[in-house]
Interface confidence: medium
């Protein structure tokens, strides 16, 4: 807290300019009018104030706007944004994408801070849904943003926004998140032709059901092993050896290197050894010849 002292003669600030750099902290408090600061916030960013001086300027704005800053001030906070706490930001009503971009730019190159997370949360809640422009902006600054959302939050993403998603944006998503995103992606890309469709849908396939994988196996897509290894185990298990061979194309040889890892390991256990042998890869662990396979899950479903 900066103590209240009278402004020395001749030091009253008439405008926000670089001469204020040289004001001691108590002089800034005494000589800078909060309303003047609010109307000239755009100048603050160009002036290399000390962190302690920024604290004084923030304190002045807090006194002027105890209920939260107006967007006209927020948009020009610049580096002063780094001085804001999540509690400060919860008082704001940010509606302009330009304001959001301006503040994200300040934090560019750093991890997502609690301040930024709060800002984004306020912005998205204010908009009601994660529209394409917002998603474009957020993933440009934070590629992992989508995967930081809960499945419930992801459900508010409209399919049209999926076009903004890049493969790297999904790197840290877990299966529950991909379960929500995959149907949206399928809808978004439904009018594309086979090969183009596969390129776009590939990153989302960790949420694909068995029937969609079967359909893809009929389209000569040549799925790479890295994508295959990210598929849901329960979606892979019902696939036949022939279907997996078609799905992977020339990449099928990579199964050998992954035979001890899920979902390949579990899939092998479900296949007849005879069928696995047709691949010529030396995969072992299939169901021996002469054994009967009972699908108990089907039995339960029928009864």
């Amino acid at each position: 807290e900066v103590e209240k002292t009278a402004c020395p003669s001749g030091k009253k600030a008439r405008e926000i300019d670089e001469s204020l750099i040289f004001y001691k902290k108590w002089e800034l408090e005494a000589c800078v009018d909060a309303a003047l600061l609010a109307t000239q916030m755009d100048r603050v960013n160009a002036i290399p104030f000390t962190y302690e001086q920024l604290d004084v300027l923030k304190h002045k704005l807090d006194e002027l706007y105890p209920q939260g800053y107006p967007e006209s001030v927020i948009q020009h906070l610049g580096y002063l944004f780094l001085k804001m706490s999540p509690e400060d930001i919860r008082k704001w009503n940010v509606t302009s994408l330009e304001t959001l971009k301006a503040l994200l730019e300040v934090n560019k190159g750093h991890e997502m801070s609690p301040q930024v997370a709060t800002l984004i949360d306020r912005f998205v809640k204010g908009r009601g849904q994660l529209d394409k422009d917002t998603l474009d902006t957020l993933t440009a600054f934070y590629p992992g943003y989508l995967c930081s959302l809960s499945p419930e939050e992801l459900s508010s993403v409209p399919p049209s926004s999926i076009w903004a998603v890049r493969p790297q944006d999904l790197d840290t998503c877990d299966p529950r998140q991909l379960d929500v995103l995959y149907p949206k992606a399928r809808l978004a890309f439904q009018n594309m032709n086979g090969s183009e469709y596969f390129v776009k849908i590939q990153s989302f396939l960790g949420g694909a059901p068995t029937e969609d994988l079967k359909a893809l196996s009929q389209q000569n897509v040549s799925m790479d092993l890295a994508t295959f290894m990210k598929l849901r185990t329960d979606a892979v298990l019902p696939l036949t050896v022939a279907e997996v061979q078609k799905l992977l194309g020339p990449h099928v040889e990579g199964l050998k290197a992954e035979e001890r890892h899920r979902p390949v390991r579990d899939w092998i256990l479900r296949q007849r050894q005879d069928d696995l042998d047709t691949l010529g890869l030396g995969l072992q662990g299939g169901i021996p010849n002469g054994y009967l396979v009972l699908d108990l899950s089907m039995q339960e479903a029928l009864s």
């Epitope: 040289f22 960013n45 160009a46 290399p48 000390t50 962190y51 780094l82 300040v106």
Partner: antibody, heavy 126, light 108 residues
Framework: QVQLVQSGAEVKKPGESLKISCKGS???????WIWVRQMPGKGLEWMGI????????RYSPSFQGQVTISADKSISTAYLQWSSLKASDTAMYYC????????????????????WGQGTLVTVSS | DIELTQPPSVSVAPGQTARISCSGD??????VHWYQQKPGQAPVLVIY???DRPSGIPERFSGSNSGNTATLTISGTQAEDEADYYC???????????FGGGTKLTVL
């Protein structure tokens, strides 16, 4: 702890150009650098300051137009350059950095310089 | 332009108090910082913002700023304190920093 590493000693002829560097580790928006000259047997002379985060550069009047100070934020490096050296530019040149934030050195920033480079000796002689 | 004036030299006996002054017209308005420089070495910050001491600097170093003069005080001076000391402040019209001429401290 941040350390500054300056480029090595230089021997140049009058009229030649030169650019020396000062590399640090890490960077915050309030990181700033100064360059300081020390002629043989003399005191410290402030040459200029750069705050890359604010696109802010200022020169001491006696060095204005004589040198150019620049910085590359992406590699946390500051530069001092001459387009045409004179014999009177012979000196030790120090860079120093203020990091703008709560640090082991207290809560101040670039107007106070707590980290200094080892110096670059520039000799200009025909 | 602002000029900061320091005495060229100050001598002190070991264990005694050394005071180095730095005077200038603008000193009351701006913070003053002090640097120590030993032969062949880069300067080291010993006092910032008139009277604050960076971590790692011994408590015997202190600073003050009143009137037109800032003062660096070294109480219980030790042989290792023998060095050149520079005050530094700012010149408002040009927005640039300024160093004093330096004071050579000799520990007798």
């Amino acid at each position: 702890q941040v350390q500054l590493v300056q480029s090595g000693a230089e021997v140049k002829k009058p009229g030649e150009s030169l650019k020396i560097s000062c590399k640090g580790s890490g960077y915050s928006f309030n990181t700033s650098w100064i360059w300081v000259r020390q002629m043989p047997g003399k005191g410290l002379e402030w040459m200029g300051i750069i705050h890359p985060g604010h696109s802010y550069t200022r020169y001491s009047p006696s060095f204005q137009g004589q040198v150019t100070i620049s910085a590359d934020k992406s590699i946390s490096t500051a530069y001092l350059q001459w387009s045409s050296l004179k014999a009177s530019d012979t000196a030790m040149y120090y860079c120093a950095r203020g990091d703008g934030g709560p640090s082991s050195q207290g809560n101040y920033f670039g107007w106070v310089y707590d980290v200094w480079g080892q110096g670059t000796l520039v000799t200009v002689s025909s | 332009d602002i000029e900061l004036t320091q005495p060229p030299s100050v001598s002190v006996a070991p264990g005694q108090t050394a005071r180095i002054s730095c005077s200038g017209d603008n000193i009351p308005n701006f913070y003053v910082h002090w640097y120590q420089q030993k032969p062949g070495q880069a300067p080291v910050l010993v006092i910032y913002e008139d009277s604050d001491r960076p971590s790692g600097i011994p408590e015997r170093f202190s600073g003050s700023n009143s009137g037109n003069t800032a003062t660096l005080t070294i109480s219980g001076t030790q042989a290792e304190d023998e060095a050149d000391y520079y005050c530094q402040s700012y010149d408002k019209p040009t927005f640039s920093g300024v160093f004093g001429g330096g004071t050579k401290l000799t520990v007798l």
